[in-house]
């Protein structure tokens, strides 16, 4: 907290501008006016402010905003959302994209921060769903964004916004997340032929069930053993093994070197020993 | 209600053959969604797996006790056992029998014997 | 083999504590990651599955989280009954392994 003191004669300020780098925080605090900051916040951050000094800014706008700020000055918080508390975020609405964007501009290349989740959280709540171009924007700052989102949340992804999805963005995705994704993008892809929707829901391939892995072995698909890796134990292991052997095609081979491996080693104990033996591997059952 | 009881003697002479048996109440021990397993724990150490076993008599051991260890399954006694040779006092732990399922974890467990190994 | 390295080996926490131990993998164990509660003179009791799923009985302060090489149990407000060692487990590969355990004790 500042203490209330008088402006000295002749320092009021009159716009926000680099003069103000020369205040003391009281200063700050007596002689900038908290509308005038909120209406040249976008000044702000070409200001080479201290985080002392960002720390009176933002006692302002709080004092000047109690039950939280507009989007106007949201959107030109720049450097100072990184001096918001979630609880402060909290009492945000965020409607525009393009002030989400800036915000997220503000903390690029660090982890995703409480405060950064919880404004993701209020922007996708405030919009009802995670639409396309929402997720466009939130993987390309954050890839994993998806992956963090629990089962329940992904439900209210919708179909179309599938194709905003890239392989990467599913990497540390688990079986739950994969359950609620693979429905919508074999969805969204229903249209493709052949071989374009296999390399589109390949990556999704980890939320399905058996029918739809038998479906594929149909396809001359050549599954990679990496995404045969990230299937669904429970629907890798009714699969015949003429069935993998369709499903993997040229990489059936290298099922001998994850035999210790899930879903491998448990699909191998549920076979005959005599299928196996079928395809040449000396893997034991 | 899945339950396994551990069976088998206390105390085991060096060199000698450890054995122990687990019992399945409940369930049984022919279906094609568990593997059974054996585990062991030195007193005031961690776990150590020791192997598993499926229905159909397929096994697949720790390395470390391979060359010592075999479990067998008894599908009409509703029974899978252990049988570690050539035991020495580092053998001694107590003996956990435990049901893994298709999720990878052990969700049943007996709740176990104390093996010492001692002439 | 996966060496699962947990840490700390021991913790000291008051009751209402927000509790966290973690798990590190030698190498990816993609999402098989399990973890166990033991209590003195008893077997381990399942806790989580699957990195994140809570097991069925289990009071809803235990979660988890991670994948590939690094998982954490988490229990949200310490009761006085979650005083016990806890052990994370992989399942990917075999040999199937155990963390070396942590001991949650009254401070």
């Known amino acids: 907290e500042v203490e209330k003191t008088a402006c000295p004669s002749g320092k009021k300020a009159r716009e926000i501008d680099e003069s103000l780098i020369f205040y003391k925080k009281w200063e700050l605090e007596a002689c900038v006016d908290a509308a005038l900051l909120a209406t040249q916040m976008d000044r702000v951050n070409a200001i080479p402010f201290t985080y002392e000094q960002l720390d009176v800014l933002k006692h302002k706008l709080d004092e000047l905003y109690p039950q939280g700020y507009p989007e106007s000055v949201i959107q030109h918080l720049g450097y100072l959302f990184l001096k918001m508390s979630p609880e402060d975020i909290r009492k945000w609405n965020v409607t525009s994209l393009e002030t989400l964007k800036a915000l997220l501009e503000v903390n690029k290349g660090h982890e995703m921060s409480p405060q950064v989740a919880t404004l993701i959280d209020r922007f996708v709540k405030g919009r009802g769903q995670l639409d396309k171009d929402t997720l466009d924007t939130l993987t390309a700052f954050y890839p994993g964004y998806l992956c963090s989102l629990s089962p329940e949340e992904l439900s209210s992804v919708p179909p179309s916004s599938i194709w905003a999805v890239r392989p990467q963005d599913l990497d540390t995705c688990d079986p739950r997340q994969l359950d609620v994704l693979y429905p919508k993008a074999r969805l969204a892809f229903q249209n493709m032929n052949g071989s374009e929707y296999f390399v589109k829901i390949q990556s999704f391939l980890g939320g399905a069930p058996t029918e739809d892995l038998k479906a594929l072995s149909q396809q001359n698909v050549s599954m990679d053993l990496a995404t045969f890796m990230k299937l669904r134990t429970d629907a890798v292991l009714p699969l015949t093994v003429a069935e993998v052997q369709k499903l993997l095609g040229p990489h059936v081979e290298g099922l001998k070197a994850e035999e210790r491996h899930r879903p491998v080693r448990d699909w191998i104990l549920r076979q005959r020993q005599d299928d196996l033996d079928t395809l040449g591997l000396g893997l034991q059952g | 209600q899945v339950q396994l009881q551990e069976s088998g003697p206390g105390l085991v002479k060096p060199s000698e053959t450890l054995s122990l048996t687990c019992t399945v109440s409940?369930?049984?021990?022919?279906?094609?969604?568990?593997?059974w397993s054996w585990i062991r724990q030195p007193p005031g150490k961690g776990l150590e797996w020791i192997g598993y076993?499926?229905?159909?008599?397929?096994?697949n051991y720790n390395p470390s006790l391979k060359s010592r260890v075999t479990i067998s399954v008894d599908t009409s006694k509703n029974q899978f056992s252990l049988k570690l040779s050539s035991v020495t006092a580092a053998d001694t732990a107590v003996y956990y029998c435990a049901r893994e399922g298709k999720n990878g974890a052990f969700d049943i467990w007996g709740q176990g014997t104390m093996v010492t190994v001692s002439s | 083999d996966i060496q699962m390295t947990q840490s700390p080996s021991s913790l000291s926490a008051s009751v209402g504590d927000r509790v966290t131990i973690t798990c590190r993998a030698s190498q990816s164990s993609r999402y098989y990651v399990n973890w166990y509660q033991q209590k003195p003179g008893k077997a381990p009791k399942l806790l989580i599955y699957?990195?994140?799923s809570l097991q069925s009985g289990v009071p809803s302060r235990f979660s988890g989280s991670g994948s590939g090489t690094d998982f954490t149990l988490t229990i949200s407000s310490l009761q006085p009954e979650d005083f016990a060692t806890y052990y994370c487990?992989?399942?990917?590969?075999?040999?199937?392994?155990f963390g070396g355990g942590t001991k949650v004790e009254i401070k």
């Open positions: 487990q992989q399942s990917y590969s075999t040999p199937l392994t």
């Open positions: 076993i499926y229905y159909s008599g397929s096994t």
């Open positions: 699957a990195a994140s």
């Open positions: 409940g369930g049984s021990v022919s279906s094609g969604s568990y593997y």
